[in-house]
């Protein structure tokens, strides 16, 4: 496989990563599918610092991150440990409302103005952020 | 000059199988997200696949989800769309696509000439 | 998923005159919208991209309008290399999908 030394064209690197910040609303699923094209995945959260550092970039704006609870338990899309790992919830949230009339509760998790966390609908068009850590080899699979 | 050359079509009977190659030059193959687009005879396009440019993360319409797989080989410069179970609805010409390269805009920049895959018995 | 419809199937133009394609989203795609081109035998060409983005090397005479579900190309003086199919695609939202056409041919 390959290995990424430096960040692509309009990705912004921090502590080893790159990121890249969406200017445009895309439903959780979609932004998913974006970050993923682009071998990286909706921005994990695992420290107070790089919550600053994201918050600073998107500015007062709700955005996308890399954690949902579609199957159940709270997960981020990286298999990085939920329990046990950073969270920076706003009060009383997650709190799964139903009361959005939109059907279904609330399984996808965006910064707020505020930075602080919420849970809300998925296919709310929000910005996002993609993630990709350097110096990782890219597994490209074996071709049968 | 960006060039797109596919190859492998042809005739297969209801439930073979076909393996479609495209061959890439004139950029950075490994830095793009590649796709495959059909279309079949006197009709519109349909999108069918797509692949990272590390070939770690694939995604598939869900016409042809199960059955067709697209890989990549970086080394190579090509892409490739291994065709199973085959039905009379997979007719088409199959165009490989390069993405557009901006985060977000899944449209296609590049396209090859296309390969035909006729399935009938 | 979302269905993109296009207006008019045919488009029957003079050379010289101006055309203008619809395409219709059925659920807004934002200005996540491309216009190709496609010729008898040939692949689609990119156009368009944003919606009204020309892509590189497209001549000025081409040129796309709208967000949200309504879109138009403008082609704003046909010539002959002109008359061919053009097709709409989102990215909005995955699966991307395509419209069916519009073929321009000569009045």
């Known amino acids: 496989g390959s290995e990424r030394t430096c960040c692509p064209v309009n990705w912004v690197e921090h502590e080893r990563s790159c990121y890249w910040f969406s200017r445009s609303g895309k439903a959780w699923a979609d932004a998913d599918n974006y970050c993923r094209l682009e071998d990286a995945h909706l921005v994990v959260v695992t420290s107070w610092e790089e919550q600053k550092f994201v918050q600073h970039h998107i500015g007062p704006v709700n955005t996308w991150m890399g954690l949902h609870d579609q199957n159940g338990p709270w997960k981020w899309v990286d298999g990085t440990d939920y329990e046990t790992g950073f969270k920076n919830w706003r009060p009383e949230q997650p709190d799964d409302w139903y009361g959005h009339g939109l059907g279904g509760g609330e399984d996808c998790a965006h910064f707020t103005d505020d930075g602080r966390w919420n849970d809300d609908v998925c296919q709310r068009p929000y910005r996002w952020v993609c993630e990709t850590e350097l110096d990782k080899a890219s597994q490209e699979p074996p071709l049968l | 000059e960006v060039q797109l050359l596919e190859s492998g079509g042809g005739l297969v009977q209801p439930g073979g199988s076909l393996r479609l190659s495209c061959a890439a030059s004139?950029?950075?193959?490994?830095?793009?997200?590649m796709s495959w687009v059909r279309q079949a005879p006197g009709k519109g396009l349909e999108w069918v696949s797509a692949?990272?440019?590390?070939?770690?993360?694939?995604f598939y319409a869900d016409s042809v989800k199960g059955r067709f797989t697209i890989s990549r080989d970086n080394s190579k410069n090509t892409l490739y769309l291994q065709m199973n179970s085959l039905r009379a609805e997979d007719t088409a010409v199959y165009y490989c696509?390069?993405?557009?390269?901006?985060?977000?805009?899944?449209?296609?920049?590049?396209w090859g000439q296309g390969t035909l895959v006729t399935v009938s018995s | 998923e979302i269905v993109m419809t296009q207006s008019p199937a045919i488009l029957s133009v003079f050379p010289g005159e101006r055309a203008t394609l619809s395409c219709r989203a059925s659920q807004s795609v934002s200005s996540d919208l491309a216009w190709y081109q496609q010729k008898p035998g040939q692949a689609p060409r990119l156009l368009i991209y944003?919606?009204?983005t020309r892509a590189t090397g497209m001549p000025a005479r081409f040129s796309g309008g709208g967000s949200g579900t309504e879109f138009t190309l403008t082609i704003s003086s046909l010539q002959s290399e002109h008359f061919a199919v053009y097709y709409c695609?989102?990215?909005?939202?995955?699966?991307?999908?395509f419209g069916p056409g519009t073929k321009v041919d000569i009045k």
């Open positions: 695609q989102q990215y909005s939202n995955w699966p991307f999908t």
């Open positions: 004139g950029f950075t193959f490994s830095s793009y997200a």
């Open positions: 696509a390069k993405f557009f390269g901006v985060v977000g805009v899944g449209c296609f920049d590049y």
């Open positions: 944003g919606a009204s």
């Open positions: 692949i990272s440019g590390s070939g770690g993360n694939t």
